[in-house]
Interface confidence: medium
Amino acid sequence: QRLSRAQQQLPLESLGWDIAELQLNHTGPQQDPRLYWQGGPALGRSFLRGPELDKGQLRIRRDGIYMVHIQVTLAICSSTSTSRHHHPTTLAVGICSPASRSISLLRLSFHQGCTIASQRLTPLARGDTLCTNLTGTLLPSRNTDETFFGVQWVRP
Amino acid sequence: QRLSRAQQQLPLESLGWDIAELQLNHTGPQQDPRLYWQGGPALGRSFLRGPELDKGQLRIRRDGIYMVHIQVTLAICSSTSTSRHHHPTTLAVGICSPASRSISLLRLSFHQGCTIASQRLTPLARGDTLCTNLTGTLLPSRNTDETFFGVQWVRP
Amino acid sequence: QRLSRAQQQLPLESLGWDIAELQLNHTGPQQDPRLYWQGGPALGRSFLRGPELDKGQLRIRRDGIYMVHIQVTLAICSSTSTSRHHHPTTLAVGICSPASRSISLLRLSFHQGCTIASQRLTPLARGDTLCTNLTGTLLPSRNTDETFFGVQWVRP
């Protein structure tokens, strides 16, 4: 897919430097499995440059292929607390709106670990809102070096 | 944050192609939890293009947002060796100097696993030195496909 | 390593936008530990833009440093099914051809987990074919949000 002449001549940032790294704000109310995120220099090392937050969920503002990454660490966790004696704890990242584009992008279970971390490349479109759903009874750590979620635009 | 006209007109490399992928050299002496890294084509597939090594620790030479990634595999490891019967083994990546910018960027515990792997986006500044601290009694594998640490500049 | 004047003046895509994200197609026959991949918009969110598939294995078409990432989730898996009572299940990503460049790039064992995920930076050359070998008796999930493999060109 070739870049148009206009794209070639625009400053580099116009090709898309969209990037965000978020820290956990809070979990949702009882029946809401979503994690709610926050970002900005005032909060520490999190930031939003292009994407935006809509009620704690990340909204994409530029079409393209993105690298999506996440790490979630469970608080007050030991290998036994995530083992088969409990309802399995699972983390799923997906497009939750618009509804017509709803899909799970990345899913991991904790099994006998207390941290999951992964990343993937995926096409995203302007207006896609990403939700991170944590199912199970265990709570995530809010430490900024243990739980974070980010996206990086990598190409049109 | 817009790129200056000067930045727009410089060759692309001047916007920052800084990148490094390191392999484990050795662990520190008894009371030093840091891992010591090495890099360069003569060693195999590791390299430094921009960042530099200072006594086995990675020093940043260009301001920007970086993707930091790491994988560490424990040697002579089984699920039991990393379980609750042992002092927990934890890996933390952080800025260790200058002292004024000291902070933990990324932290993972091994629990019942023998490998941790993660990545995150974080702003780094020229002169920041990244340290990777492995606490606990288990040793890391020096296999170059099992233990590695890298950074990639992704935007100003 | 400075970019040549020709490189500086070419449209950005000519510097290398090569990128791919693949989903699992199938496992190999009995004695073949390789995973076979597929990609393309008709299949969902997987794609190939530059690299190509050769009998289910990913072939690189442009020299450069790449970020290679993978997530593999085992199907019908519990912590006990990956524990020490079984032959260890291991995933290795490597260059499998040409033979002269054969090397393991990234290796992880499942231990008591059911998912592995990691990423690394590595130099790859035109013609390198990447193979992903899953050893052990457990089968991978073909869910596209649980098992995927991708590469992204990041610099010359």
Epitope: - | Q23, N25, H26, T27, Q38, G40, P41, A42, L43, G44, R45, S46, A75, I76, C77, T137, L139, P140, S141, R142, N143, T144, D145 | A92, G94, S102, I103, S104, R107
Partner: antibody
Framework: EVQLVESGGGLVQPGGSLRLSCAAS????????MNWVRQAPGKGLEWVSD????????YYADSVKGRFTISRDNSKNSLYLQMNSLRAEDTAVYYC???????????????WGQGTLVTVSS | QAVVTQEPSLTVSPGGTVTLTCGLK?????????PTWYQQTPGQAPRLLIY???TRHSGVPDRFSGSILGNKAALTITGAQADDEAEYFC??????????FGGGTQLTVLG
């Protein structure tokens, strides 16, 4: 089945040179660290040298440092030991040994060749 | 002078139990030395038996076991058999990246 076959041993005068080879088969050679271990006649084992899976990092016992060079060719599944400035005390059976990969801080040799005898004598 | 010490020779009766030890000239052996044991029969290459103090290598019979006894690493053979007659070497991790081997213990199975 893992197989390691050493060759290149023989009689050499003090100060001379010899190159040992080890042909590996039955496993993915490029994944493993490889080692040379020697055993003087009637004596114990002595670790000599190791090389990482890519061939870029090498370590040597103090007794051979500066005289011996370990190398490998992954495309040929082969390990080598170039021995220069040989001394009488280098007389030994030289074994090629695969590191199990459990740790490369702690060499653990899970597969050995049958050895090749090097005799340094005038 | 050897840094790693072993009994030069030991004898056991068929079906009996014998313990071989591996010590340090100065200091105690701990699991941080990652004791490893090898068996060598005459004219053969060494064979890995035990690593990481007490982990049996694949294919090694369970009559072989490893442990730390007091300030030494130990290899215990229970129900000794005639083909256990061999020389046994221990190896300890002392300084990165090398291992030090002991002088070996010649085990004789009487009978």
């Amino acid at each position: 089945e893992v197989q390691l076959v050493e060759s290149g041993g023989g009689l050499v005068q003090p100060g001379g040179s010899l190159r040992l080879s080890c042909a590996a088969s039955g496993f993915t050679f490029s994944v493993y660290y490889m080692n040379w271990v020697r055993q003087a006649p009637g004596k114990g084992l002595e670790w000599v040298s190791d090389i990482n899976n890519e061939g870029g990092t090498t370590y040597y016992a103090d007794s051979v440092k500066g005289r011996f060079t370990i190398s490998r060719d992954n495309s040929k599944n082969s390990l080598y030991l170039q021995m220069n400035s040989l001394r009488a005390e280098d007389t030994a059976v030289y074994y090629c040994a695969r590191d199990a990969g459990y740790s490369n801080h702690v060499p653990i040799f899970d597969s050995w060749g049958q050895g090749t005898l090097v005799t340094v004598s005038s | 002078q050897a840094v790693v010490t072993q009994e030069p020779s030991l004898t056991v009766s068929p079906g009996g139990t014998v313990t071989l030890t591996c010590g340090l000239k100065s200091g105690s052996v701990t699991s941080d030395n990652f004791p490893t044991w090898y068996q060598q029969t005459p004219g053969q290459a060494p064979r890995l038996l035990i690593y990481n103090t007490n982990t049996r290598h694949s294919g090694v019979p369970d009559r072989f076991s490893g442990s730390i006894l007091g300030n030494k690493a130990a290899l215990t053979i229970t129900g000794a058999q005639a083909d256990d007659e061999a020389e046994y070497f221990c190896a300890l991790f002392i300084s990165n990246p090398s291992v030090e081997f002991g002088g070996g213990t010649q085990l004789t199975v009487l009978g």
